[in-house]
Structure formats: C-alpha cells, structure tokens
C-alpha cells in the first residue's frame, strides 16, 4: 500500500492558544492544531490514534502529508479539508482506520495536489457517489488523485443499507470521469462478488489494480483491453474457477503486466485446459508454479503446471462450499 | 432507490413501428448494462440485447436482429428499444432490466405490453 | 445458443416443504447461472447470481449450487408468498438464455 509516510524529524507538539481573541484569525502558518504532530521541514501533519471525532480546522498551509489515522471521524463532510487559503500543498492523505461510515459529496475538494489517499479500515456505509468528482455533472473536473487506497472499507453485513455495495464502491471511482488519471487502485478485502461490466476500461491509467482478498467469482466480462499501462494485477484470495479463453488473451496482450493468483480454489476439470497451456508458456503470472488444484477432489492440490490434457476431464459436480468463498 | 419506469401500453397494426422507452432513476445510468427481455403470454423469457449506456455499444440475440434497435439518452438517462415490421409474434410483454452482476438483472422496469392487431 | 432445460415445469407444495428445482445447461456455463422469482402481475425478480449468491434482500431460505451443466434451486421451507414462477438463466455467453420456468402452487 502506498499511503503516505514521512521520514519526519523534530516534530512539535500543540501548544495551548494563547488568547482568544487570536481564533477568529486565520491559523499562524506554523500553528500546529491541538492532539497532532507537526514537522514543517517534513511538510508532515500526524494526527494519529487521539479519537477525533471531525477534521481540524487549523491545518497548517504548509502540509504535504497529513496522517488522521486511528481516530473516530464518523462522517467526512463536504468540504472536510477547505480552508482558506487552501491547503495548496496537500498531496498525500491518509485517513485509515478511521471509523468513518459516511463520506460524502466534495469531501475532498479544494485540494489542488492531493495525488495520494487512503480510506482504508474504514466501514462505508455510504460512499458518495460525488466523494472524489465533487460534483454531480456528467463530466466533472479531473481529480488529481494518482493513487486510491479502499483496502477493507466494507461495512458488516447489517450497515449495507439494502444495496450493492460494489454498486456503491463503482459509483464513486466512475462519477463524472473524475479519476481517468488515476494510477494505482487498491480495493484488497472488500468482499466483492463481482465487477460490474467495463468498469476498468473507464479507469485507462491505472498500473497497480490490487483486487486481492475478495471473493470474485468470475473474469468472464471483466475487460483489461483499454488498460495498457497495467503493471500489476493482484487477484489472490479469491473464488476464481478458471480463466476462459477471451481473459487470457486479454492478460497476454498487456506489454508490462504481472499477474498474482495465487490462492483461487481452480476446478481441474475440461474446461481447465486452455488455461493449464497458456499457464506454462506465459510469462505474466508470477509464482505460477504455487497455483494448485482445489476441485475435483482427485485433483485436489495437483499443481496446474504438471497437468495435461489427460488429467482434465469433464464434468465435476461440485460441493455446495465452492460456490463461493 | 433504483427504479425503471417503462412507457404505456401499445396496440398497433401489423407491418407498424413501436418504440418504447425505460426512464433509469437511483443510480448511475452509465454505470451498468441496460438489458430487454420479451415475455410472450404465458411464456418464459427470451433475451434481446443489451446496451452500454456509457458508449451506446450493443449486443444482440440473433434472432432480434433486424427486428428490434436498443439506444441511449444519457442526458435523460433514459433507453429505448424500437420494434419495427411488427406481426402478432411480436405481441408480448418487454421489460426493460438494469445489469448487476454480469448479465444477471437485479431491477427490472414494470413491463410494456405490445399488442400487435388490425 | 445454450438450451436451458429446467424441470419440472409444475410443482404443487404445501406450506414448509422443501422444494427443488433443477436445470441442466446444454454446454458448461461454469458458475455463471441466475435463478429469477415471477409473481403473478409481476416484473421478475432477481433471487440469486453467479450460482449461489442471494440478491440483496433475499431470505435465506433460498438457496442455489451446481457448477458446469448441472445446477440446483432449492426453497428450504415454502411459505404462502413464495407462490409464482422460478426461471433459471445463463449468462455465460451470449445470447443469454433462460429456463422454462417451474410453477409453484399449493396443494
């Protein structure tokens, strides 16, 4: 995960205000707010494990990395991080671990350089359809994020306000193609069943999609095609049967890709063969030779590297646990 | 919510054109798929087609080609799906249905009942 | 086109039996299979995807399986409102194709 980390030295603490009468003047530049750790040579704001309960208002201007882990945030309101003048220089935010349920609409507006966020270990409930575009227009201002980190942001089961929460997750990053620019996308964790058809041909940029930890059951209409800077794939840990012809290929044509799927309970059966040859002739999957079968039982942990056409026969009926993970 | 309001009752003359329309409200209309579905009286489910709101792309069951035309308005976020060369076959009831998960229709419109009579 | 052959195509239950649909797909379809509810007067409804996995609101008392060619629909404990029509759909490839349906009414 690529959230922001500082290698800040001499951090000061808060210091009382001294009088009153100074709050109603805009924050001193070098003004630390109270409960957090400022280093101005490092451009860091550490607001870490003090269960705060909504955003500072006296934000330093000069912050570039600002740290409001661990806290009780609860909801981020829109306009969470403006101030005036604004926080010009912010470009790596970190919000995880949180307890925010709620993000809504332009909570992250006026922050011209915010290039770096992390929501992660945070149970949304209601993610903005408008949280990273801002706006509600077809087509909103590009966003300057390059990276987004939503590992483990799904609420439990009771919090999911009868909806899809994938549903919900896909609105946000496709909202008025605010985040054609983004680079890495991190969405480990999440309990995801599906990807809504062509959502990733909407996000061209992206080198780093980590969908590991999920519970996908199928690529069939997932398209790669449009993402030909993609670097890494990271699809560990999920309910992945096998990978059908029209995936392969797609995998295949990317120039710089690496693909992870290690940890998918793969079914042996006919339908395996396609994936078994391109397995040992591609370069793409790393730790290829790890991937084993888990169905049918006779195959059970039968590396699908040392499988051929002889080993895969048809059709397995299959237990009621494998339907999903 | 998510809700699909779909066009008034048709009755119209063989050889005759129809054009019925499925107004999308509670999500994001580009987001997903927007599938139509033909149910003739007291018959199973046939698939037409499907749309990509996002860039008008379509898919088509064979059988429908020729026969039906699927478009978007995104301004309206509203799909459309126009029969033309309508004999009493076509009689029927359409609907159409948001895609969640691929392929599968988690809402569906209230249906449009065309009826095709001289 | 994949043929969907679903049975039976009428079952008659009392309230809290267990009933079991079936549908056989004339090629694999992998694990990609929907199974569908229709009342009378009503639009369809979506009760499980990719399977097993119920839609949003859905008891769990129903329940899908089945994997390839051979898949399986089953409502634990039939209540009153349970009564219309089930239909199983492929979306493996196009164009989808759906059962025949099985109609539920009660004894």
């Known amino acids: 995960s690529s959230s922001p980390t500082s290698s800040a030295s001499s951090f000061s603490s808060s210091a009382p205000f001294l009088a009153s009468a100074v709050s109603a003047q805009p924050p001193l530049p070098d003004q630390c707010p109270a409960l957090c750790e400022c280093s101005e040579a490092a451009r860091t704001v550490k607001c870490v494990n003090r269960n705060l309960t909504e955003v500072p208002t006296d934000l330093p201007a000069y912050v570039r990395n600002l740290f409001l882990t661990g806290n009780q945030l609860a909801v981020l309101p829109a306009g969470a991080f403006a101030r005036r003048p604004p926080l010009a220089e912010l470009a790596a935010l970190n919000l995880s671990g949180s307890r925010l349920d709620e993000v809504r609409a332009g909570a992250f507006e006026h922050l011209p350089s915010l290039r770096q966020l992390d929501l992660s270990h945070n149970p949304l409930a209601d993610l903005s359809p408008f949280a990273f575009s801002g706006s509600n227009a077809s087509v909103s201002a590009p966003s300057p994020l390059v990276e987004l980190i939503l590992n483990h942001i799904v609420p439990p089961e009771d919090e999911r306000q009868n909806r899809s929460f994938e549903g919900m997750v896909v609105a946000a990053l496709l909202a008025g193609r605010a985040l054609q620019g983004l680079r890495r996308l991190e969405l480990a964790s999440n309990h995801f069943l599906y990807l809504p058809r062509d959502v990733l041909a909407q996000l061209p940029s992206l080198r780093h999609l980590d969908l590991s930890n999920n519970s996908l059951v199928s690529l069939t209409y997932v398209s790669f095609r449009n993402l030909t800077h993609l670097e890494s794939l990271h699809l560990e840990d999920n309910a992945l049967k096998v990978l059908h012809n029209g995936t392969l290929a797609e995998l295949q044509g990317l120039p710089h890709i690496r693909v992870f799927l290690d940890n998918n309970p793969w079914v042996c059966d006919c339908h395996m063969a396609d994936m078994v040859t391109w397995l040992k002739e591609t370069e793409v999957v790393q730790g290829k030779d790890r991937l084993t079968c888990a169905y049918p039982e006779k195959m059970r942990n039968r590396v699908l590297l040392e499988l051929n056409s002889a080993d895969l026969d048809c059709d397995p009926i299959l237990p009621p646990s494998l339907q999903t993970s | 919510q998510v809700q699909l309001q779909q066009s008034g009752p048709e009755v119209v003359k063989p050889g005759a054109s129809v054009k019925i329309s499925c107004k999308a409200s509670g999500y994001t209309f580009t987001d997903y798929y927007m599938n139509w579905v033909k149910q003739s009286r007291g018959k199973s489910l046939e698939w037409i087609g499907d749309i990509n709101p996002n860039n008008g792309g379509t898919n088509y069951n064979q059988k429908f080609k020729g026969k039906a035309t699927l478009t978007v308005d995104k301004s309206s976020s509203t799909a459309y799906m126009e029969l033309r060369s309508l004999t009493s076959e076509d009689s029927a009831v359409y609907y159409c249905?948001?895609?969640?998960?691929?392929?599968?229709?988690?809402?569906w419109g209230q249906g449009t009942s065309v009826t095709v009579s001289s | 086109n994949i043929v969907m052959t679903q049975t039976p195509k009428f079952l008659l239950v009392s309230a809290g039996d267990r009933v079991t649909i079936t549908c056989k797909a004339s090629?694999?379809?992998?694990?990609?299979v929907a199974w569908y509810q229709q009342k009378p007067g009503q639009s369809p409804k979506l009760l499980i995807y990719?399977?097993?996995n119920r839609s949003i609101g859905v008891p769990d008392r129903f329940t899908g399986s089945g994997y390839g060619t051979d898949f399986t629909f089953t409502i634990s404990t039939v209540q009153a409102e349970d009564l219309a029509v089930y239909f199983c759909?492929?979306?493996?490839?196009?164009?989808?194709?759906f059962g025949g349906g099985t109609r539920l009414e009660m004894k």
């Open positions: 990719y399977v097993s």
């Open positions: 249905a948001k895609e969640g998960p691929p392929g599968a229709m988690d809402y």
């Open positions: 759909q492929q979306v493996y490839s196009s164009p989808f194709t």
């Open positions: 090629q694999s379809v992998s694990n990609h």
